[in-house]
């Protein structure tokens, strides 16, 4: 995207500063909070974005537990630290010295402790399930079309590679979508699932990440698929490590 | 079925203006990003420009920046290409090509059999 | 900007032959690499995107393989229809350059 255009932003994430100070005067944009330079021809990573959110805080997110790995976002927002790729860092503290071991997508994965609490690696969520329901309409959708779209939305608005969606079920009104993404797969340059699926989730709550005024606009032959919630269960290469006190 | 049909080209003189039009049908035109793609006699394929599903972001090659703009109306389903201060090596046959699905960036996997347009005095 | 480089730009096989065309990227553009067909006078039509996914409708001996900055387009068995110019495309980002094309004959 170049500067010589009379826009000069950031086609995949609004929540940047964009300016014509790049090479041979491109268009260069930086994300709100980090002021970390962003690849504008791809997703943002979540840490930046969430970040950049926390200049406009809206309703935290809420994570369902499908299994005894699976995590819940209980702690909603929070100022995250992220590495100079973007990435979480594994470790998460806050003002007061409270600190948490997180996964890939951010989403705690140990109790809380102090200042000593060591992580000793970014443990991976290298499985997604998407969990929406979406809205009557007059009959059900046909799944392969329904499964053909959803495929189709997260290879070309999302950019993730096709070989990262494992499946689509579907029975009426409920839709999962299953993303897998071992780190041994995952080469330089792929879309994280964890990426693709914070996207996503943020475009059928209507608060899209994408510049522009269109927003998600999901149809299979041609009717509209308007989702009505969305639960999303994340599950890491390595269990959580809780206190026993938690799960009881 | 999915179609896309190009109008407008036709011989014009260096330094005037031409708009090639595109008319989309059987699919929603609405959500996919469009892109121009231009082919000079007996040459090669050379992508001329894009334009988001929502009108959100354009891009150019260089060597049209700030002489081509693209555009479309979503509700006519059409995909226009408007170019001034044309030279001779605009010469090609110009097609238009459907991109991604609710984005810019994707291959072309539909495609209108082109308009020719020729710069001469 | 990022430039895409095909190779050979001719070839001539016969039919039944397996038969590789390459192409080269500048710079890492990930899976983001198509691969599209041009018959004599006809309009271009896309058979391989994302690098290896095959296009519904395109027939199976057409296949595309690699990442990053070098891929690979095979006909496993070449066909007396499989006359035309092959080109490979970028779509990462703008601009989405085109390789040069390489015109494939029958001996």
């Known amino acids: 995207h170049t500067a010589a255009q009379d826009n000069c932003t950031c086609p995949t994430n609004k929540m940047t500063v964009c300016s014509p100070d790049g090479p041979g005067g491109r268009c260069q944009c930086r994300a709100l909070g980090s002021g970390v330079a962003v690849d504008c021809s791809t997703l943002t990573s979540e840490c930046l974005l969430l970040k950049a959110r926390m200049s406009a805080p809206k309703n935290a997110r809420t994570l369902v537990r499908p299994n005894e790995h699976a995590l819940v976002d209980n702690d909603g927002l929070y100022d995250p630290d992220c590495d100079p790729e973007g990435r979480f860092k594994a470790r998460q503290c806050n003002q007061t010295s409270v600190c948490w071991c997180v996964n890939s997508v951010g989403v705690r994965r140990t109790d809380k402790g102090d200042l000593s609490l060591r992580c000793d690696e970014l443990v991976r969520t290298h499985h997604i399930l998407i969990d929406l329901r979406h809205r009557p309409t007059a009959g059900a959708f046909n799944h392969s079309d329904l499964d053909a779209e959803l495929r189709r939305l997260f290879r070309e608005r999302y950019r993730l590679h096709p070989k990262f969606v494992a499946a689509v079920h579907y029975e009426q009104p409920t839709i999962q979508i299953e993303l897998r993404q071992n780190t041994s797969q995952k080469a330089a340059g792929d879309v994280d699932i964890g990426d693709a699926a914070y996207y996503f989730e943020r475009d059928v709550k209507g608060e899209s990440l994408f510049q522009g005024r269109g927003g998600l606009d999901l149809r299979v032959r041609g009717e509209p698929l308007q989702v009505e919630r969305t639960l999303i269960y994340y599950l890491d290469e390595i269990p959580p490590k809780f206190s026993m006190k938690r799960l009881t | 079925q999915v179609q896309l049909v190009e109008s407008g080209g036709g011989v014009v003189q260096p330094g005037r203006s031409l708009r090639v039009s595109c008319a989309a049908s059987g699919f929603i035109f609405s959500t996919y990003g469009m892109h121009w793609v231009r082919q000079a006699p007996g040459k090669g394929l050379e992508w001329v420009a894009v334009?988001?599903?929502?009108?959100?972001?354009?891009d150019y090659v260089d060597s049209v920046k700030g002489r081509f703009t693209i555009s479309r109306d979503n509700s006519k389903n059409t995909l226009y290409l408007q170019m001034n201060s044309l030279r001779g090596e605009d010469t090609a046959v110009y097609y238009c090509a459907r991109g991604g699905y609710n984005s810019g960036w994707w291959a072309f996997d539909v495609w209108g059999q082109g308009t020719l347009v020729t710069v001469s005095s | 900007d990022i430039q895409m480089t095909q190779s050979p730009s001719s070839l001539s096989a016969s039919v039944g032959d397996r038969v590789t065309i390459t192409c080269r990227a500048s710079q890492g553009i990930s899976h983001f690499l198509a691969w599209y067909q041009q018959k004599p006078g006809k309009v271009p039509k896309l058979l391989i995107y994302?690098?290896?996914t095959l296009q519904s409708g395109v027939p199976s001996r057409f296949s595309g393989s690699g990442s990053g900055t070098d891929f690979t387009l095979t006909i496993s068995s070449l066909q007396p229809e499989d006359v035309a110019t092959y080109y490979c495309?970028?779509?990462?980002?703008?601009?989405?350059?085109f390789g040069g094309g390489t015109k494939v004959e029958i001996k």
């Open positions: 495309q970028k779509f990462n980002s703008a601009p989405l350059t």
């Open positions: 994302a690098a290896s």
């Open positions: 334009i988001w599903y929502d009108g959100s972001n354009e």
